[in-house]
Interface confidence: low
Amino acid sequence: ECVTQLLKDTCFEGGDITTVFTPSAKYCQVVCTYHPRCLLFTFTAESPSEDPTRWFTCVLKDSVTETLPRVNRTAAISGYSFKQCSHQISACNKDIYVDLDMKGINYNSSVAKSAQECQERCTDDVHCHFFTYATRQFPSLEHRNICLLKHTQTGTPTRITKLDKVVSGFSLKSCALSNLACIRDIFPNTVFADSNIDSVMAPDAFVCGRICTHHPGCLFFTFFSQEWPKESQRNLCLLKTSESGLPSTRIKKSKALSGFSLQSCRHSIPVFCHSSFYHDTDFLGEELDIVAAKSHEACQKLCTNAVRCQFFTYTPAQASCNEGKGKCYLKLSSNGSPTKILHGRGGISGYTLRLCKMDNECTTKIKPRIVGGTASVRGEWPWQVTLHTTSPTQRHLCGGSIIGNQWILTAAHCFYGVESPKILRVYSGILNQSEIKEDTSFFGVQEIIIHDQYKMAESGYDIALLKLETTVNYTDSQRPICLPSKGDRNVIYTDCWVTGWGYRKLRDKIQNTLQKAKIPLVTNEECQKRYRGHKITHKMICAGYREGGKDACKGDSGGPLSCKHNEVWHLVGITSWGEGCAQRERPGVYTNVVEYVDWILEKTQAV
């Protein structure tokens, strides 16, 4: 059962797992949600009736029954983790806490103009978990405007105390706002020989990398595969750190793999969601329950539905035993990972999918592409929307992309002459324009947000957001696309597609069926050569074949240039402008979305 409200002056008795410090009950609930075992918590607020050393304590709790006895206590605030809920969860915390000193290891001290600048510095520093900033009213003159960057083993403060004229806050890495590079490569036959902060068992290097990504202290990892010669270290995932933030030594070792935390791009990759099945693999851990199940998929569903289950092992039925049902072992451990992994026993193992909601919806795998052909099939581009105007008559105006449950990203030039959002309709999950009838459901537009530096498509800033009047319920045919990571600026995308209902040639009409075309990206230098009369800026990205023949065209404007990278689709460009359509040596010019991520997040996350 999902309980989101907080219980004031209430304390849960017993069930303590650990105590951390958080600046608010709301953040305590987030910490509880992300902890592998926490189901309930009690937070102690600042209060004259309470011992100051207990202020801001956040006691994480677990219970076999999923609840605990309640006791009245002034200043205590209790609640439940969001693990029990189905809604999307984010660790992003933009709050600034006034007159609070969040303690940790102060490893960097520098002058900053504002708390915002201090927070940005923390966000762009690989080690920083949170910061404290002494404001210009701070009593000690020489320490005014000092920005202290801090980290701890847990990622949460070691203590929180009242301190006048300082402000504290958290790194915004989990808000997708870090400029740190995102190194997605996994290096085979490599051991990083640096300090281990923790070690867990993992079935493969990908799971190891995901665990590293959501571990607060892990910057890179080494994974020993099941073929590793030292038996006691097989399937061992070593979580590592270093002062510089990079591995100091790489050792060539067969059957080991190493890689980096994907913290700075975690909003566009699955981090918590380990959806694969591991055949002939047994996960050991504390047994929660043993239930009969028809298949390993059914066993995974049972694990996902049991709030305390973290992973499972399914043993298929022997011949015709038990109506063909096998045994499903639901398991848990203190850190959410198996305590040991065994091979060759015939089990099929995997993880709960309950934590998938902690990942961005946009990372969910969608239907495989249909190779060849130009017409799309249903569900192939679930983020693509058709934007209609109803004035003077209803017609397709532009394309757009779902980037959040209330947000469409499109091109600013689409709104030339559009006086009011009232005349706009957004249709999602559409394959054929002919599906749109009088009674077809649509999303009304509450607000059009055009970039304030936009003048015309050719001069850039051709980007706009539509805030919808109601929220989109994600399904297989309508779901968001990931924004590119700022840390991914140097990624070379090789699998890019432009989609839309636009013209197929310059003098044509809007197409009925959503069209798709695979188009290679072109460097900005190359693009500039093709458009000597224009300035191709770094805020633009170009795509097209030298010989022409495939391109976006009139009516595709505002739609996505979608690129697949590491199994996840990213909105790399917004169809903006070009000379003609599909002309030789005239690539299409798109708004370079990565350069506007800050702008998008600022507008969509504004309170």
Epitope: G104, S140, Q153, T158, T161, S195, I197
Partner: antibody
């Protein structure tokens, strides 16, 4: 009650490596806390050498960093100090200590060993 | 590194006297300061943490105050068993640093 006990040679030759071990009883190192080394030259004040977490994360005093290695062996419930290229200036009583709080902040040294005198002399 | 300057380096007082030791930090360290007592031939013992909090089991005649750069350690009524050297220690920034110590003797 947590107890710490330093052990190692009392005499080390100049340019050699000083090696000390701190055996912990009454508490499992792997359960948390920072575990540190502090030294005190005869008749002088205290100097923090460095600290280590159960997981292997280390923090060292920059003045000694190039010569110091602190490691932990959770299976033996002990942690160790190695100080290379020693000189007479490294003659001191070496203490091992445990922090007051389990969270990862080197703050207060609450539990101390009784100390062991290491003399650097040829 | 943050320098911790303790004064006086030694003092002599009578039993029952009020004894005050000061510790000055080279930069603002908020209240991230501890006080230790070290008796001859023994390891230091934590008395005060966070500038003013008394460690469990420590007699109430010991107290600490201050914030920022200036801190004070007080023994309200000196007892014979208080003969020791007292050290302050900051944990605001790494490396952890200690004051030079104040040796307290009885007249």
């Amino acid at each position: 009650e947590v107890q710490l006990q330093e052990s190692g040679p009392g005499l080390v030759k100049p340019s050699e490596t000083l090696s000390l071990t701190c055996a912990v009883s009454g508490y499992s190192i792997s359960s948390g806390y920072f575990w540190g080394w502090i030294r005190q030259p005869p008749g002088k004040g205290l100097e923090w050498i460095g600290s280590i977490l159960h997981s292997g994360v280390t923090y060292y005093n920059p003045s000694l960093k190039s010569r110091v290695t602190i490691s932990v062996d959770t299976s033996k419930n002990q942690f160790s100090l190695k100080l290379s290229s020693v000189t007479a200036a490294d003659t001191a009583v070496y203490y091992c200590a445990r922090d007051r709080t389990t969270v990862s902040m080197i703050e207060y040294f609450q539990h101390w060993g009784q100390g062991t005198l290491v003399t650097v002399s040829s | 590194d943050i320098q911790m300057t303790q004064s006086p380096s030694s003092l002599s007082a009578s039993v029952g006297d009020r004894v005050t030791i000061t510790c000055q930090a080279s930069q603002d360290i908020s209240n991230y300061l501890n006080w230790y007592q070290q008796k001859p031939g023994k390891a230091p013992k934590l008395l005060i943490y966070d500038a003013s909090n008394l460690e469990t089991g420590v007699p109430s005649r010991f107290s600490g105050s201050g914030s920022g750069t200036d801190f004070t350690f007080t023994i309200s009524s000196l007892q014979p068993e208080d003969i020791a050297t007292y050290y302050c220690q900051q944990f605001h920034l790494l490396p952890i640093t200690f004051g030079g110590g104040t040796k307290v003797e009885i007249k």
